[in-house]
């Protein structure tokens, strides 16, 4: 039994649970997902039993080995996978545990503007970046682009302070998870702050 193996997959993609066995005489191999039997292999008779019908087309054993390939991944395939190799030559089954994380491909992140104030010709606000469908494990980075700056800011919230008369700036939110990355539509400081320009002390959403 080796240490737990962490695997990553993407929705719609495939993942292979690697299995290298030194066991000579294998009676059966049982793959389990979150305590539910998934597949049972009996090498002697060449029997492969897939427990649930819906998994039949998704399960494969590439190259004639016992490593399990799971295709057409869904979000709820995330979880703990466990394989047991049973043999009369072993007192205890040889086991291996895996943890699978399935992530979604990220769509364009959405940007919302917080309360905006315009004092002494300086526009102050926060930009918040988020995924519309609340995807998990997303890391956000902001790029602030302009003649005077090319800066990165970590986190979903970007505080902005832009003075009228300064060169325009462009803000882009970049979202990443382990399987994909995407970016927001660009936001121009001048356009963002235009609404607050008329009333120097205005606050708006």
């Amino acid at each position: 039994s080796g240490p737990v193996k962490e695997l990553v997959g993407s929705v719609g993609g495939a993942v292979t649970f690697p299995l290298k066995s030194k066991v000579k005489q294998v009676d059966s191999i049982v793959w389990t997902f979150n305590t539910t039997p998934l597949v049972t292999i009996q090498p002697e008779g060449g029997t492969i039993i897939v427990t649930q019908n819906r998994n039949r087309e998704r399960v494969d054993f590439p190259d004639g080995g016992y490593s399990l390939k799971l295709s057409k991944l869904k979000k709820n395939d995330s979880g703990i996978y466990y394989v047991g190799i049973y043999s009369s030559s072993l007192q205890q089954p040889s086991t291996q545990e895996y943890v699978l994380h399935v992530y979604e491909h990220l769509s364009k992140p959405k940007v919302t503007m917080g309360l905006q104030s315009n004092k002494n010709g300086t526009c102050v606000t926060n930009l918040t970046c988020c995924m519309e469908h609340g995807e998990e494990d997303v890391i956000y980075t902001w790029k602030a682009l302009g003649q005077a700056a090319n800066e990165s800011h970590n986190g979903s919230i970007l505080p902005i302070s832009w003075r009228w008369g300064e060169s325009d700036m462009t803000f882009i939110c970049v979202a990443r998870n382990p399987v994909s990355r995407n970016f927001s539509s660009p936001i121009l400081a001048r356009k963002l702050c235009e609404g607050a320009a008329d009333d120097p002390d205005s606050s708006m959403v």
């Epitope: 993407s10 682009l145 399987v179 990355r181």
Partner: antibody
Framework: EVQLVESGGGLVQPGGSLRLSCAAS????????MSWVRQAPGKGLEWIGE????????NYAPSLKDKFIISRDNAKNSLYLQMNSLRAEDTAVYYC????????????WGQGTLVTVSS | QIVLSQSPAILSASVGDRVTITCKAS??????VAWYQQKPGKVPKLLIY???TRHTGVPDRFSGSGSGTDFTLTISSLQPEDVATYYC?????????FGQGTKVEIK
């Protein structure tokens, strides 16, 4: 020094296969998306595809999806391009490229390796 | 896929001239455009990204502009060392695509 070095190019017959390698050094290879780009003699640049840090996502140019396979080995700091069913029009210099700060534009390129498909 | 059309294909200008290369996208790419310089026999070098941001170490005679479908790379004062082929790239959507290139020569 950040460096990418391609190898494995050469002369191959039409219908043949070839595996290119790209050895990375000077940066944390296991954290970066990586791409392959090719350039036919006297022609422009063509993006082949990219692979994410843990190999769970591979994106290809649709026209090349069925004949090229991108893979990587983070333990060896290496990127690979398996090319199958090669034709004369696949003759090109093949570059591996790293995106700047893991964005989408490439700031580090290998020196390229020439693949010639001819009988 | 998004097609990028560069013009002109070949540009001949004198040292000190202001040079402009255009890149037209077949659909809106926002500002997801990069520009590269490739000198003869060399590998491509990143000049500009996000349409107008100069990469580290790139001389300030190089500038980029544009958004949506129309983009421009400008060399404010052409130098002998700028002889190269220039490519635009879009990274707004898969597959990433490059323009066919503009060859810049000295008269």
């Amino acid at each position: 020094e950040v460096q990418l070095v391609e190898s494995g190019g050469g002369l191959v017959q039409p219908g043949g296969s070839l595996r290119l390698s790209c050895a990375a050094s000077g940066f944390d290879f296991s954290r970066y998306w990586m791409s392959w780009v090719r350039q036919a003699p006297g022609k422009g640049l063509e993006w082949i595809g990219e692979i994410n840090p843990d190999s769970s996502t591979i994106n290809y140019a649709p026209s090349l999806k069925d004949k090229f396979i991108i893979s990587r080995d983070n333990a060896k700091n290496s990127l690979y391009l398996q090319m199958n069913s090669l034709r004369a029009e696949d003759t090109a210099v093949y570059y591996c490229a790293r995106p700047d700060g893991n964005y989408w534009y490439f700031d580090v390129w290998g020196q390229g390796t020439l693949v010639t498909v001819s009988s | 896929q998004i097609v990028l059309s560069q013009s002109p294909a070949i540009l001949s200008a004198s040292v000190g001239d202001r040079v402009t290369i255009t890149c037209k996208a077949s659909q809106d790419v926002g500002i997801a455009v990069a520009w590269y310089q490739q000198k003869p026999g060399k590998v491509p070098k990143l000049l500009i990204y996000w349409a107008s941001t100069r990469h580290t170490g790139v001389p300030d005679r190089f500038s980029g502009s544009g958004s949506g479908t129309d983009f421009t790379l400008t060399i404010s004062s052409l130098q002998p060392e700028d002889v190269a082929t220039y490519y635009c790239q879009q990274y707004s959507s898969y597959p990433y695509t490059f323009g066919q290139g503009t060859k810049v020569e000295i008269k």
